[in-house]
Each structure stands twice: as C-alpha cells, then as structure tokens.
C-alpha cells in the first residue's frame, strides 16, 4: 500500500522535571505528485506515416498514461495534421490533479524536406556537400526549425554542411536529423565515398632526341588511379597533343623538325563524374640538325656585258644552327667562282664575254648544306670593244 | 522515380546460398546508387548493402560483411546480392532501393525512412 510507517519521537518535561520520552506510531499516507509536476518535462517523439501523412506522437513516459479527450493508446497520440497545435490532458493513478496539459506542436510533413548533395562535381574527390531543401510550403514556424548533422566525430547545427579536404575515394557516413521544437520529426543518413582524385605525377625517366626528325620520352606512371595519358609537345608556338594508352611507359615521337627546341608534357588523367588531370611533368630536347630546304626564288640578272647579280630568297627550313649562303658558277665543268655570303646576294664580275654559266645557290646551316637551286645564264659579247672596218680598193 | 522489381527469394538451408534480382525501369540507371535493404518478421527493416551508380564502390552493414556481395550490370538494368553463408538470422523479406547519385563515386542513404515507394520484396527464408 501507499501508506508507511513513521515513528515520531517526542520529548516533554515532567512537573518534577524529569524528562518523559514518549513514543507514538501513526500510519501516514504519503502525498502524491500532482501530473503536472509529475509529467513536467515529458519528452516527445514524432513519427509520420508517408501514406495518410499524419503524425502520431509517443509519449517517452515509463507507464501507460491517460491523454483525456485525446484517446492515446501505447502511450501514443494518433492522427495528428502538421503544423497544427494538440492539446492532451496526461493522467495517471500515480498522480493527482491538476493534470499535465501537453501542447502538441505537431511538425511540418517529412516529405516537405529533402537532403540534396550540393556537393560541386569538379570538387566531389575532396569535398562532400549536404544540404536540406524545403521542396513543398507549410505554415509551421520555420523558426523553430533546427538542423543537425553528424560527419564522423564532427557535429554542426546548420542547414547546411560543406566538408573540405577530405581524401579522394573514402568513405563518409553522414547523419542528419530536423528538430521541430526541439523534437526530432525527420532523419536521414547518407554512405558518402568521394570521387576519384586527380592521378599524381608521372616521374620522367629520360626524353631526348639523337636523330633529326624523332625524338624518345620513357616515364614511370603515377601511383593514383587513372585511365590514360596525355602527351604534348609543343614547339614556338605550335602544340600538338596525344592520347596514350594507360600502359605505356615509352613514347616515340616522329616527324619532327630538325634543329627545334620541343617541349613535352605528360600528365595523366581519370575520367571521373568529370575528367581530373593530374600534374604535368616537363621535359624538352632539341632535335638533331639535317639538310636545309632548297633557297628559292633566285633570280640572275645582267649588270654589265659580264657582270651578273645573283639573289635569292632564304630557305623555308633553315635545320640547323648557322646561316651561310653559297654561289658556284661553272662553265662547262669547270668551277670558275666559289663565293659565300651572310645574305643570299651575289655580285659576280669579270666573267667571260659570251659564255655560257650555271650559277649555282645553296644554304649552308653549318652541318648540311641544302639542295642548290640552280639557274643558266650567258655573258654578252663585248659591246664596248673597237671593231676596224678595212676597205679594199 | 525508378520502378524496382526483386527477384530471387526462396527457402534455403543454414550455410547456403541464393542471389537476389532487381530489375529497375524508368530512369537513367548508372545514375542511381542502388542498394538493398530487408525485413525480418516482427523487426524494423535495415539496411543491408549499396552499391554506386559505375559499380565501383560498395558499402555494407556489418552483419553481412564478408558474406554478402552486391553487384550490378547497368545494361541490365539489374543490380544482385548475392548472399553465401546463410544464417537464421538472414530470414527477412529483402527490398532494393534507388537512390540518385550525383557527383560521388557513392551516395546512398541507409535510412528507410528517406524512401517513399517499397516493391513487393523477395522473401529468403533460412532454415536451421
């Protein structure tokens, strides 16, 4: 029973002054909380039924109360419409009146928010980005509205998460919960792996060239995943680029110019939810010298009975690293002049009056000398020698 | 919304093995992170397995780890789980979920809860 024994002790003094001590056992019983102080901080759970879109809210009460008006069964008030105040009058035999009155602020529906990844495509290898969106209107409060999310040991109260720095292809798990009131009506909890990050690297191992028109780069490939390589090769200004397969290591290159400074780059790349290139390693080479292009354009010209002016313009692929032009003139195959100049402009004097030459020009680069462009021209008769007429009478 | 089909589902005894069938349609498939869950009789459902969108990454509940093995054939349209030393305690009504992955190698969530439309299941059945 509700009652117990309390034993009160009681000291009086006698007329004679000696001390009485009388003892007398009643039977008390003890005064009940009242609901209201009983039920002062009860808490509640909210959970929402996607297909009639009610609430039902659960009482966190050790025993199976009475809600008055308001039927609850199990502890549970059922049927309640979002955004709408219920008024439940909690009771139990283990208190007295005045009861509880618990104001239920009933959240919004759970299907009015949805967590969306806002996460930016080109950042998804290091950055994981959560946010709630309210995709439909209600009337509650959005005030007392609160977010929370859970990323590993890190906590925060926003709407909104953005995680940073974080480690390409790992693994996240990251919950989250909306508060209503403080109440909890909705949660969700996402497995996050990031993308794939950018590949490393390539470490060049050599890239040279030992022939006029080829040149050779070897490589070791990055350590991170990847799908393919890109080699370019860039000269002046000119840049031309190639697809590799994964599992190459060596690459030849062909038709190059001679005597050109090439500057490679190599960088591997993943095709992710978008493609990521790693670093680029660099390397350059000067390709060998060969024979330079043929002069072209030349012209001979008459300055005199027997004078010639030779010219001609530079070749287009010079190949190498000087620049010295070359003139033979022959007659018959005999080799009478053998000139060079910085320029391609010759003055060819003192030539023999009414004779056939070849002139031939050519580039030389220093190593190679180019095609001749050859042309045939022939010397005057001498126009300002004295012819004497003798007349036979 | 992608429509979801599972297959697969039967009595099987204690140690063996079934694979598990989902057929989705309507949607474009290798966008989805698609993923398992079950329920057993008289227990909330639970998450069992994930799997995203290329097929590349897997996630698992630690009750299935090692046992389990999900995969998936975007060309089918199909996505498996194949489950090998069945317990008892496997014995559940299985589900497989969709859910939109975007950006991430894998973007799945385990809570029920975040998904509005169930299929009918498939019921694995282990008996001891």
């Known amino acids: 029973s509700d009652a117990y024994l309390n034993a009160s002790e009681t000291t009086t003094l006698s007329p004679s002054g000696s001390a009485v001590i009388s003892t007398t056992t009643i039977a008390t019983t003890p005064s009940k909380p009242t609901c209201d102080e009983k039920y002062a901080n009860i808490t509640v759970d909210y959970l929402y039924n996607k297909e009639t879109k009610l609430f039902t809210a659960k009482l966190n009460v050790n025993e199976n109360v009475e809600c008055g008006n308001n039927t609850c069964t199990n502890n549970e008030v059922h049927n309640l419409t979002e955004c709408k105040n219920a008024s439940v009058s909690i009771s139990h035999n283990s208190c007295t009146a005045p009861d509880k009155t618990l104001i239920l602020d009933v959240p919004p529906g759970v299907e009015k928010f949805q967590l969306h990844d806002c996460t930016q495509v080109e950042k998804a290898d290091t950055t994981i980005c959560l946010k709630w969106k309210n995709i439909e209107t209600f009337t509650c409060d959005t005030q007392n509205i609160t977010y929370r999310f859970q990323c590993g040991n890190m906590i925060f109260d926003n709407k909104e998460i953005k995680l940073e720095n974080l480690e390409p292809e790992h693994e996240y798990k990251c919950d989250s919960e909306i508060l209503y009131n403080n109440h909890k009506f909705t949660n969700a909890s996402k497995i996050i792996k990031t993308d794939f990050g950018s590949p490393g690297e390539p470490q060049i191992i050599f890239c040279r060239s030992e022939a006029a028109h080829q040149g050779v780069i070897t490589w070791n490939p990055p350590q991170r995943s990847f799908h393919n390589f890109t080699l370019c090769y860039i000269k002046e200004t000119e840049k031309d680029c190639l697809n590799l397969d994964k599992n190459l290591i060596k690459y030849d290159l062909q038709n190059l110019k001679p005597y050109t400074k090439y500057v490679l780059s190599l960088h591997a790349y993943i095709i992710a939810k978008v493609q990521r290139n790693g670093s680029a390693a660099m390397c350059h080479f000067t390709t060998k010298s060969a024979p330079p292009s043929q002069v072209w354009n030349m012209t001979v010209s008459m300055t005199s009975d027997n004078s010639m002016h030779v010219k001609c313009r530079p070749p287009r692929d010079r190949n190498g690293p000087h620049e010295r032009y070359h003139l033979e003139v022959e007659a018959g195959n005999t080799l009478v002049r053998n000139e060079s100049h910085k320029n391609c402009d010759f003055r060819v004097k003192d030539l023999q009056y009414s004779t056939d030459y070849t002139f031939k020009a050519y580039f030389h680069n220093g190593d190679y000398p180019g095609e001749p462009f050859i042309l045939h021209h022939s010397t005057s008769y001498n126009s300002k020698a004295h012819h004497h007429h003798h007349h036979h009478h | 919304q992608v429509q979801l089909q599972e297959s697969g589902g039967g009595l099987v005894q204690t140690g063996g093995s079934l694979t598990l069938s989902c057929v989705a349609s309507?949607?474009?498939?290798?966008?989805?992170?698609m993923g398992w869950f079950r329920q057993a009789p008289g227990k909330e459902r639970e998450f069992v397995a994930a799997?995203?969108?290329?097929?590349?990454?897997?996630y698992y509940a630690d009750s299935v780890k090692g046992r389990f093995t999900i995969s998936r054939d975007n060309a089918k349209n199909s996505v498996y789980l194949q489950m090998n030393s069945l317990k008892p305690e496997d014995t559940a009504v299985y589900y497989c979920?969709?859910?939109?992955?975007?950006?991430?190698?894998?973007?799945?969530?385990?809570?029920?809860?975040?998904?509005?439309?169930w299929g009918q299941g498939t019921l694995v059945t282990v008996s001891s």
């Open positions: 979920q969709a859910d939109p992955t975007m950006f991430h190698k894998l973007y799945y969530g385990i809570n029920p809860n975040e998904y509005d439309y």
């Open positions: 799997i995203g969108g290329s097929g590349d990454s897997t």
């Open positions: 309507g949607g474009t498939f290798s966008s989805y992170a």
